[in-house]
């Protein structure tokens, strides 16, 4: 089992985050297009 040092505020330290969001219509305050990581 994991020891506490493997976690930072409940998040696994080594886990990759989502990709940076894409704002294709950047000149408007639009919703982002998010593309999930392929593991």
């Amino acid at each position: 089992s994991y020891s506490m040092e493997h976690f930072r505020w409940g998040k696994p330290v080594g886990k990759k985050r989502r990709p940076v969001k894409v704002y294709p219509n950047g000149a408007e305050d639009e919703s982002a297009e998010a593309f999930p990581l392929e593991f």
């Epitope: 894409v22 950047g26 305050d29 392929e38």
Partner: antibody, heavy 113, light 112 residues
């Protein structure tokens, strides 16, 4: 108008510190992923760090331990605190709204004695 | 950190030519790849994201392909306004020990 405006660049001696600001207008900075990218004179683009919309920050190896990204939501502004500056940090520094066409105009940082 | 290797670094071409630029990632990044165009003294302009999706207002002569570690930007018929420097960018996720955002070294497309 949606835009980012950087400020705070200038001439600094090796080993010195500088804080760059990235002021957002037309959108709420805390709702978006923001990158810091630099470009040395005549060279290519280099991503040095980012802050996700939730406030988490990540840094390239070249910036880790020396650079810190923070955010002031009340001022709708992001900051890049740069310490222990070296000659190779000389560049135009841009803040960027995620992956998009919203880039600041850039601010030049020159590290020289 | 992710390493992005772009080739060629310089490309001499004529108006009307078909131009291909390649980008290789040091690790698989799925389709989290963008292409930017930069002209001297200007901020980069987004051309393509998600490896193959054209950004708003970008002419259809630009196209992108690839996934995983190998990517390509193609200009089907080079126009005078296309002489510029092109960069690929990975924008996959980061972790405490890995930074997944990186640019290729750039490809300068110049007039032959």
């Amino acid at each position: 108008e949606v835009q980012l405006v950087e400020s705070g660049g200038g001439l600094v001696q090796p080993g010195g510190s500088l804080r760059l600001s990235c002021a957002a207008s037309g959108f709420t900075v805390s709702a978006y992923d923001i990158l810091w990218v630099r470009q040395a004179p005549g060279k290519g683009l280099e991503s040095i760090g980012m802050m996700y919309d939730d406030g988490d920050t990540y840094y390239a190896t070249s910036a880790k331990g020396r650079f810190t990204i923070s955010r002031d939501n009340s001022k709708n502004t992001l900051y890049l605190q740069m310490n222990s500056l070296r000659a190779e940090d000389t560049a135009v520094y841009y803040c960027v709204k995620g992956v998009s066409n919203i880039w600041g105009q850039g601010t030049l940082v020159t590290v020289s004695s | 950190d992710i390493q992005m290797t772009q080739s060629p670094s310089t490309l001499s071409a004529s108006v009307g030519d078909r131009v291909t630029i390649t980008c290789q990632a040091s690790q698989s990044i799925g389709s989290s790849l963008a292409w930017y165009q930069q002209k001297p003294g200007k901020a980069p302009k987004l051309l393509i994201y998600s490896a193959s999706t054209l950004a708003s207002g970008v002419p259809s002569r630009f196209s992108g392909s690839g996934s995983g570690t190998e990517f390509t930007l193609t200009i089907s018929s080079l126009q005078p306004d296309d002489f510029a420097t092109y960069y690929c960018q990975s924008y996959e996720g980061s972790s405490s020990s890995y930074y997944g955002i990186g640019f290729g070294g750039g490809t300068k497309v110049e007039i032959k």
